[in-house]
């Protein structure tokens, strides 16, 4: 899915008020400097292609971020304020929901998530030059 | 500009058929559901049909449903209502509406300048 | 079905002044995802209508800020801060939440 039609500000304004402390609600009990942030973004557009990625798809020792609440606000955001992405994810979806799996939160699930924070955080900064 | 532009609307007798037409442009159209609303002489407005993007899901209003048949052509950007079996109740202006899918929560972002269909003896 | 139930019916307003319109949905309009699917709209005399409002208060392209809307749950509520000559028309709320989509009979606004 190409992002660079989206309502960048609308998105924004949705991770500020309930997806941001979605994610710090995920991750209490962990230490802010416990995980370094290896996955960067350059541009809004880059950022949420990140962000769905991570979110969405599952990986190695972290298949369950999916059904979590900032995982469903994110997709409501995107949804709402991307015009086709809720199409392009139909079929997404229905493949998601035929190998969902137990829900554990791991190590490797908060280690994704505080790449999200990172990214998420990228995303409200966008003229900010890249490290 | 973003535009919708409907055709197609003339009178018709009880048990008749027509075909509206809406041509899109301004916009990318295979990226919307698109919503045909209706609105009877002097009447609110009521919600007729909606389509998404590729035509994946459809749906219709009690009312019009084994009758009305919603179609896009993504490749032409035009929407289409196939009416057929039409009742003097069928009788309102038609609007082609942009919306309906997830996008802005489903509300009709832009709407045509609307067809007249009447449906008389 | 959902059934809207908008109040008042007309509404005669002295330009400057502020006016509010009431929308009652006969279940909740808050999906579980966090977002509530209820949109304002005004036809203007003649005129097609236009999207004013949408998921309850956010603003759509070009609407004055005179114009805002609140509420939650099952009950809405739409202002208009100062009310101008050209805000005359008839302002109708809608649920997406679920199929059949349904509009409020409409609530007509005119100029004293």
């Known amino acids: 899915y190409d992002f660079t039609n989206c309502d960048f500000e609308k998105i924004k304004a949705a991770y500020l008020s309930t997806i941001s402390k979605d994610l710090i609600t995920y991750m209490s009990g962990t230490k802010s400097t416990e995980f370094n942030n290896t996955v960067s973004c350059s541009n809004r557009p880059h950022c949420l292609t990140e962000i769905q990625s991570l979110t969405f798809n599952p990986t190695a020792g972290c298949a369950s971020l999916a059904k979590e609440m900032f995982a469903m606000k994110t997709k409501a955001a995107l949804a709402i304020w991307c015009p086709g992405y809720s199409e392009t994810q139909i079929n997404a979806t229905q493949a998601m929901k035929k190998r969902r799996k137990r829900k554990v939160t791991t190590n490797k699930c908060l280690e994704q998530v505080s790449q999200l924070q990172g990214l998420w955080r990228r995303f409200n900064r966008p003229l900010l030059k890249q490290q | 500009e973003v535009q919708l532009v409907e055709s197609g609307g003339g009178l018709v007798q009880p048990g008749g058929s027509l075909r509206l037409s809406c041509a899109a442009s301004?916009?990318?159209?295979?990226?919307?559901?698109m919503t045909w609303v209706r609105q009877a002489p002097g009447k609110g407005l009521e919600w007729v049909s909606s389509?998404?993007?590729?035509?994946?899901?459809?749906y219709y209003a009690d009312s019009v449903k084994g009758r009305f048949t919603i179609s896009r052509d993504n490749a032409k950007n035009s929407l289409s209502l196939q009416m057929n079996s039409l009742r003097a109740e069928d009788t309102a202006v038609y609007y082609c509406?942009?919306?309906?899918?997830?996008?802005?929560?489903?509300?009709?972002?832009?709407w045509g300048q609307g067809v007249l269909v009447t449906v008389s003896s | 079905d959902i059934v809207m139930t908008q109040t008042p019916l007309s509404l005669s307003v002295t330009p400057g002044e502020p006016a509010s319109i009431s929308c009652r949905s006969s279940q909740s309009l808050l999906h579980s995802y966090g977002y509530t699917y209820l949109h304002w709209y005004l036809q203007k005399p003649g005129q097609s209508p236009q999207l004013l409002i949408y998921?309850?208060?956010y603003r759509a392209s070009g609407v004055p800020d005179r114009f805002s809307g609140s509420g939650s749950d099952t009950d809405f509520t739409l202002k208009i801060s100062r009310v101008e000559a050209e805000d005359v028309g008839v302002y109708y709320c809608?649920?997406?939440?679920?199929?059949?989509?349904?509009f409020g009979g409409g609530t007509k606004v005119e100029i004293k």
């Open positions: 509406t942009r919306g309906g899918g997830a996008y802005y929560g489903g509300s009709l972002d832009v």
């Open positions: 389509i998404t993007f590729a035509s994946s899901y459809i």
């Open positions: 301004g916009f990318t159209f295979s990226n919307y559901g």
């Open positions: 809608e649920q997406t939440l679920q199929t059949p989509y349904t």
């Open positions: 998921l309850v208060s």
